[in-house]
């Protein structure tokens, strides 16, 4: 895990002092990952509580800073940073000693192998003539007489150390403040030197430049300023992190910074610096973290305190000890990635004198299997061997090694192989919207296996169909529209995900059933006629240019622009071509149109018709009755309507022979004050039906119908005539 805890020892003022924890993990800060934690760990080294609570400042998801110290005692003790997710969650510890302590460690972090002897050494900073107590994780461990100091140092020798011996050790003068102690950290690897893994049977890769082999996974934890699977490569000055991606802040570079990395590395100064405050440059001939490495450059190489030997032309190697005549493996990726089940070709190029040939180059897998090259390409400056790898399994993940051996010598280069599992969707794609001939689909699905997702293939076909699936490659971050589908049809839709590289296609995910909408009703009706059948009634007729292929009925829309109101009349019968609209508002101008509909979809509207309904008339006249006066005369009498809607302009009388089939006849009573009429010219001995209505602006309702017969046998009349008068 790429996690670094930094303390800036140049800052002595507690109020300005801060600690920073940086995560360089790929994908660090994914929303699913727990955040970085940076805190003081008071479980072993307890000091007085700080005057004010410490506070964390986050710089994005990959960096966190702890501030808010108020007095020197706040700084003394153990700080921890926790980062990474799941099984890779890692804790990095930093132990801070007080610059004014009685005793001070010669070296704070000690990393040793199982079974080694560890020597912790504290030098006297302020002498006190009392015994020195050594503690382990806060518990009493040993006592030394003050006179046992050797050359001003108290030493604790721990023989045959085992992993449980790991922890925080302290050396304190009896009866002195614990803040004046020298605090140490001992890290005991779970294996002997050069070994790792369960049972410690696996060989470490041979970490260079002070890198420490992790006892669980065999990876090198590289000192700050070095990178590569074996820490073989120096970063540019002022850079750190597993890929040299981080930079020391400010103009001073890494001067005065102490770097703490995941166990079993511990803490050290940055490359090129040493001393308790990491402010001293390496002495000539020394380089690396804490200046622990010696250059010992040969063949005219010069020592650089950050990167080691800089070799002249014609020489290479850590000490410039390898002539370019000795075979040398040329640049290779330090880490490669393949998909499970693939049979990749791995190339390894080497130069040297004598020239490497086919049999001189081999590839070693993590399980020890040796592969011979299947093909060799010889060029003037190099030989490239190509290795065909059998079908990869997850067990092939780990460190592979390319080896070259000639009579001039040998060389090897390790590289890490990561075997990845192609992604397989766990969920079906999601329907976002639909129309008659298209579906809008979200291809984003959760998946098992490894990312990143390089492409998404969407497959679809009609439900219960055996035809080939239609395929479309889509952008995983964008919704996709499936076009030219059949209306009202179910489609099975499924997703296939791919990750980069050959064989990166995963299996199909579960399919979702998505159904397209009804087809649009594509016919436009035409309004053929519209008749006012009363102040609040309208009969409408329409036509269609042809029989509709799809349609459930018609929607008639009446728009009353003056009131801003719309009325919709649903005619749920696709064969209908006429409708009677009732309950309309008398005296209103309407704009009328008609559309065909199917399911919830509307077809195009007809051109609108403009209809004016007449105002409503008055109520019916009251108490109409009839009386025969002779064989040709009948008198009608009535009373005015109740509360007419304005001044009555006339009355209309309707006369019809009872039981007859002829049309009725109407007579106007033009003087509205008259409420009586004598109808003359009727046929003798004939029964008649009468009713009457008033007119204001519009015609009113008819009164009740009355029946009356003329008297005796008289002459046949030409037809009724009237005489009216006021009642």
């Amino acid at each position: 895990v790429d996690l670094t805890l930094l303390a800036n020892l140049r800052i002595t003022d507690p109020q300005r002092f801060f600690l920073t924890c940086v995560s360089g993990e790929a994908g660090a800060g994914r929303s699913s990952d727990p955040p970085l934690l940076l805190e003081k760990d008071d479980r072993i080294v307890r000091t007085f509580p700080p005057g004010q609570p410490l506070y964390l400042a986050r710089n994005g998801s990959h960096q966190v800073t702890l501030r808010g110290f108020s007095k020197p005692s706040d700084l003394v003790g153990v700080f921890s940073c926790v980062g990474g997710a799941g099984a890779r969650r890692t804790r990095v510890l930093y132990v801070h000693n007080s610059p004014g302590a009685h005793l001070f460690p010669d070296k704070v972090t000690h990393t040793v192998n199982k079974g080694d002897t560890a020597v912790l050494s504290a030098h006297v900073h302020k002498e006190k003539q009392t015994d020195v107590i050594w503690k382990n994780n806060g518990s009493y461990f040993n006592t030394l007489d003050w006179q046992e100091a050797d050359d001003g140092r108290f030493q604790l020798q721990l023989q045959n150390v085992q992993p449980p011996s790991s922890g925080i050790y302290s050396a304190t003068y009896l009866e002195a403040s614990p803040l004046g102690s020298a605090f140490f950290r001992l890290i005991v690897r779970g294996c002997g030197a050069g070994r790792w893994g369960p049972g410690c049977v696996k060989d470490c890769p041979g970490c260079l430049h002070g890198g420490v082999c992790h006892d669980h996974d065999g990876e090198c934890v590289c000192p700050p300023g070095f990178t590569g699977t074996r820490c073989e490569q120096a970063c540019r000055e002022g850079r750190f992190g597993q890929s040299c991606q981080e930079q020391c802040p400010g103009t001073a570079g890494c001067r005065g910074l102490t770097f703490c990395l995941p166990d079993p590395y511990g803490c050290s100064c940055g490359s090129g610096w040493r001393g308790s405050q990491c402010q001293e440059a390496c002495a000539p001939g020394h380089f690396g973290a804490d200046c622990r490495l010696q250059c010992q450059c040969q063949n005219g190489g010069t020592c650089d305190r950050f990167s080691g030997c800089v070799c002249p032309s014609g020489w290479h190697g850590v000490h410039c000890e390898k002539s370019d005549r000795i075979p040398q493996i040329l640049s290779m990726a330090t880490e490669v990635e393949f998909n499970i089940g693939t049979m990749p070709r791995i190339n390894c190029a080497a130069a040297g004198n004598p020239f490497p040939v086919r049999g001189s180059m081999k590839l070693r897998k993590p399980d020890g299997t040796m592969l011979l090259s299947t093909k060799v390409i010889v060029e003037p400056d190099r030989t490239t061997a190509e290795f065909e790898v059998p079908s990869l399994t997850l067990g092939d993940s780990g460190f592979w090694e390319c080896r070259v051996s000639t009579s001039g010598g040998q060389d090897s280069r390790r590289f890490k192989v990561n075997v990845k599992v192609p992604p397989v969707p766990l969920t079906a794609p999601r329907l976002l919207a639909k129309q008659s001939r298209q579906l809008v689909v979200s291809p984003l699905v959760s998946f098992s296996g490894d990312g990143p997702i390089s492409s998404v293939r969407l497959h679809y076909r009609p439900q219960d169909s055996t035809i080939a699936w239609s395929a479309i490659v889509v952008d995983p971050s964008e919704n996709v529209t499936l076009m030219n589908l059949k209306p009202k049809t179910g489609y099975n839709v499924r997703v296939q995900l791919s990750r980069p590289g050959e064989g990166g296609e995963g299996g199909w995910g579960p399919s979702a059933l998505m159904t397209t909408d009804c087809p649009e009703p594509l016919l436009q009706p035409w309004l053929e006629s519209w008749h006012v059948e009363g102040p609040d009634r309208l009969r409408v007729s329409w036509s269609l240019p042809s029989v509709p292929l799809s349609g459930d009925g018609f929607l008639l829309r009446l728009w009353d622009g003056a009131r801003g109101q719309e009325r919709r009349e649903n005619i749920s019968f696709p064969q209908a071509r006429t409708a009677l609209l009732t309950g309309l508002t008398p005296g209103t101008h309407y704009q009328l149109d008609v559309r065909l509909y199917h399911c919830t979809l509307l077809g195009p509207a007809s051109p609108p018709a403009h209809v004016h309904l007449p105002p409503s008339g008055p109520p019916a006249p009251r108490h109409l009755h009839a009386q025969a006066l002779s064989d040709s005369e009948i008198q009608l009498m009535w009373q005015h309507p109740e509360a007419p809607s304005g001044p009555i302009s006339k009355y209309i009388v309707e006369i019809q022979v009872a039981g007859g089939s002829g049309d009725p006849q109407w007579m106007d009573v033009d003087r509205p004050e008259e409420t009586s009429i004598i109808v003359r010219g009727l046929n003798a001995s004939t029964r008649y039906l009468f009713r009457v209505r008033a007119s204001v602006q519009g015609l009113g309702d008819w009164s009740n119908t009355v029946e009356e017969a003329t008297l005796g046998n008289g002459l046949q009349s030409e037809g009724p005539v009237r005489e009216s008068r006021a009642a």
Epitope: E520, L522, L523, Q524, W526, L527, E528, S529, S543, L544, P545, S546, D593, L601, L602, P604, A605, S606, P607, P608, A609
Partner: antibody
Framework: EVQLLESGGGLVQPGGSLRLSCAAS????????MVWVRQAPGKGLEWVSV????????GYADSVKGRFTISRDNSKNTLYLQVNSLRAEDTAVYYC?????????????WGQGTLVTVSS | DIQMTQSPSSLSASVGDRVTITCRAS??????LAWYQQKPGKVPKLLIY???TLQSGVPSRFSGSGSGTDFTLTISSLQPEDVATYYC?????????FGQGTRLEIK
Amino acid sequence: EVQLLESGGGLVQPGGSLRLSCAASGFTFSMYGMVWVRQAPGKGLEWVSVISPSGGNTGYADSVKGRFTISRDNSKNTLYLQVNSLRAEDTAVYYCARAPRGYSYGYYYWGQGTLVTVSS
Amino acid sequence: DIQMTQSPSSLSASVGDRVTITCRASQGIGHYLAWYQQKPGKVPKLLIYTASTLQSGVPSRFSGSGSGTDFTLTISSLQPEDVATYYCQQFNSYPHTFGQGTRLEIK
């Protein structure tokens, strides 16, 4: 072959009137709605009016409502546009076109147009 | 009334380029949209009807898509003879309004 031929355009003073005609042939005229579309010089297309196959249903753009009247004589296979109270902004080429009967929404058949110029 | 807005109002492209003209309706019009091509002094020519159906005889480099309020006319590989003004028109409700037009020229 479907043919539409407009006539009746010309120079007219503001406030004046014209009657545009569109003679149709090559199809059953009484089965199709018909439209008028106009285009002012150097400008875009403007939909003007529509009439149903029977002539009973008409529609107009707001800019011509109350001044223009569309009609048809199915016995003569002719479409008309009576244009009254003409204004300078009515100056345009007037096209007649056959309305779709449904399913294919677009005007495929157009006449060659007749130019109406309103100027004093 | 439904307003139809075309963009851009004019554009210049090279022969072989992919050209896209968009048309936006002020309210939903389903698929009831047509595209026309008009060359100077000529009658408009129907290219696409009912939003996406290619009129018989029109080259396949022309295509239409969209529904509701947003529509697109695409010329997959511009040819010299495609220089013209292009119009969209809605048929959802009267008046059957046109877009203001897009003038296309060759660079």
